[in-house]
């Protein structure tokens, strides 16, 4: 039950996160005009990854797309790429995780397959979230650098009679949406990976020595590993479940193949 809840919650959190990443990528307010020096401007500028906009106090808003590809700063291109990769990975992750959900039955899909799919989607969500966080952080760093550069320019060029108001840009709403969305996707991914451990079918788990009448080469493996004889095909692939509750220490001592996430 807890596994299903963790998986379901991980899926929902990731879904919200990816929706947020898409929203942030499409938003125009990645950078907004800094109003510290001119709080009474009648013209407000803001920029996104795809276009820049100007909102006049009259209410008229004009947006212009960046129709050039080669003329754009490399950093902007990098941010675009990171956000798109994040969206693509997130979308694939969502698709995979839908089929991996324990509450959804698809044919005779085994739990091991669902566990693998859950792990795959979890990793995809984690990478997607990291891509979004990285993209937004790169853009934010670019803004901070440009902000201080333009501040320096403003105060060095004030000797003349005519003041040229240089537009400085600060963090826009999209950055905060991106950071939160990236974080949610990351958390959702971690939750999926945690759920994967619970979904993984446990291996044959004996608490005692396995005795066979004819057995010469009995392999004794304490708690958590397979105990099998060297003879007979009847025991080779049979999964016998212990059914007994393991202690936390036992779980830690004997990791399964799905523990390394």
């Amino acid at each position: 039950m807890a596994v299903t809840a963790c998986q379901g919650l991980g899926f929902v959190v990731s879904l919200i996160g990816i929706a947020g990443i898409i929203a942030a990528t499409c938003m125009d307010q990645w950078s907004t005009q800094d109003l510290y020096n001119n709080p009474v401007t009648a013209v407000f500028n803001y920029q996104g990854l795809w276009r820049s906009c100007v909102r006049e106090s009259s209410g008229f808003t004009e947006c212009r797309g960046y129709f050039t590809l080669l003329g754009l700063p490399a950093m902007l291109q990098a941010v675009r790429a990171l956000m798109i990769v994040g969206i693509v990975l997130g979308a694939i992750g969502l698709l995979v995780s839908i089929f991996a959900l324990k509450c959804i039955r698809i044919g005779s899909m085994e739990d091991s397959a669902k566990a693998n799919m859950t792990l795959t989607s979890g990793i995809m969500f984690i990478v997607s979230g990291l891509c979004a966080i990285a993209g937004v952080s790169v853009f934010a760093n670019m803004l901070v650098t440009n902000f201080w550069m333009s501040t320096a320019n403003m105060y060095t060029g004030m000797g003349g009679m005519v003041q040229t108001v240089q537009t400085r840009y600060t963090f826009g709403a999209a950055l905060f949406v991106g950071w939160v969305a990236g974080g949610l996707t990351l958390i959702g991914g971690v939750m999926m990976c945690i759920a994967c451990r619970g979904l993984a079918p446990e291996e044959t788990n004996y608490k005692a020595v396995s005795y066979h009448a004819s057995g010469h080469s009995v392999a004794y493996k304490p708690g958590g590993f397979k105990a099998s004889t060297g003879f007979g095909s009847n025991t080779k692939n049979k999964k016998i479940y212990d059914g007994g509750a393991r202690t936390e220490d036992e779980v830690q001592s004997y990791p399964s193949k799905h523990d390394y996430v």
Partner: antibody
Amino acid sequence: DVQLVESGGGLVQPGGSRKLSCAASGFTFSSFGMHWVRQAPEKGLEWVAYISSGSGSIYYADTVKGRFTLSRDNPKNTLFLQMTSLRSEDTAIYYCATSYYYGNALEYWGQGTSVTVSS
Amino acid sequence: DVVLTQSPSSLTVTEGEKVSMSCKSSQSLFNLGNQKNYLTWYQQKPGQTPTLLIYWASTRKSGVPDRFTGSGSGTDFTLTINTVQAEDLAVYYCQNVYSYPLTFGAGTKLDLK
């Protein structure tokens, strides 16, 4: 057709108060910023104040700051200018205008209402 | 505050003549975001209310005769009337619409000989 009709002007004593109104019609009043501009006798135009469509931003000229209060009633399509502590230099024709056009330009103007501050 | 200086304060011209008037700003009215200058020109005929002529420093409002031309960028702007007609007798005002307060210039009065 866009129409702006000012009212409320008249003779006021120095230090007195007056409330001007501007009734708008022919456009979606609630979507546009509104301005008051005045013109003293035989003088040029002087911008007085601006209010954004939702009253979120209100700006005043330094000469009237603290004395004039701008407000609007969107359901009634009306703009108001409450003037207090009036001085003789406030004597002018008061126009209400709208930034209906691109470039923050004041495209539509009312016919104006005359305010005379005199003892 | 942005201070706009209009010159000359008055002009006397003959009909058909070309006339130019200047408007200088204490600050740049150029907006980098959309590459536009936030200066507007108005015409006020005697006894009438002002009417919009030009916005964005050089864009004519629809219905305004093409003899009216706005030019300039940053801090220096010019309004040119190519062939002055009798109905152009008016006071012309420039206005800063870039930052509040939206200051006006003192105006240039156009008279006919």
